[in-house]
Amino acid sequence: MMTGTIETTGNISAEKGGSIILQCHLSSTTAQVTQVNWEQQDQLLAICNADLGWHISPSFKDRVAPGPGLGLTLQSLTVNDTGEYFCIYHTYPDGAYTGRIFLEVLESSVAEHGARFQIP
């Protein structure tokens, strides 16, 4: 029986050209994590294998950094990076747990403008 739950950073926004950390955390299970896959829509960004470490997609090698922990850092963000990201925790004996994060990448001016008119 799968008792675990995935906590994520939820819906997040970041500025174009900046960087963001995608984080998931698996709790409420004693299952062993064998591999964590990070996916963007249907594209595999990175793998962290318990024995064999991090592997980054060649398409994202220059913009994706492993960590912190089992998280993923996206750098040099573009508006095209807006969308859903998934962390898939493969565990034994439970199976796979999936967490979802929605990232919105804002134009610099929009982000600044939004910040200027925020209501405290």
Epitope: I47, G53, H55, I56, S57, A96
Partner: antibody, heavy 117, light 106 residues
Amino acid sequence: EVQLVQSGAEVKKPGASVKVSCKASGYTFTEYSIYWVRQAPGQRLEIMGRIDPKNGRTYYVDKFKNRVTITRDTSASTAYMELSSLRSEDTAVYYCARIYGFYFDFWGQGTLVTVSS
Amino acid sequence: DIQLTQSPSFLSASVGDRVTITCKGSQNVNKYLVWYQQKPGKAPKLLIYNTDNLQSGVPSRFSGSGSGTEYTLTISSLQPEDFATYYCYQYNNGFTFGQGTKVEIK
């Protein structure tokens, strides 16, 4: 053209060690991890471990953690795999392979290691 | 880790035959499946990656398909140089290979 050229066949006695080399050419050696994979007679391909040539960091599969050592010499664009405390079941063809993202795109020609008393 | 089982383990065929090899995962492979060809005394050669992407330089008679736990490699018209052993490999959970399918001359 990418090439991985391995050292020649070895015959070893049980309890001994063997060191196999893998010389890379045709690409920047430090840009791709090198894996060591073995194939015993009648068995499936089995991953042993990995080295990141850029920083020398190694990763080993649990089964081999205590007996395998992977190293590299960046000046010679060469990776090495040493397996100790050899036993008859280590008789296999040992391959080095370059990993491109998540799968192996180029392999060495293989090195047959025979363990026999 | 996902276990991969290939079928058949041995296959006898003639030049010109259409050949299909199946690779079944113990769990969902999520299309992260690769096919290799290996000839005796030679290194494995990458044929297909991510289920259906043909590696550069590989003849178009090779094709791959599948989803979930079941994947196939098809050779549309077997050529003399295709007699070899074929392996599937997955990286969705762990990095594992199938046991191989040997394609022999009938």
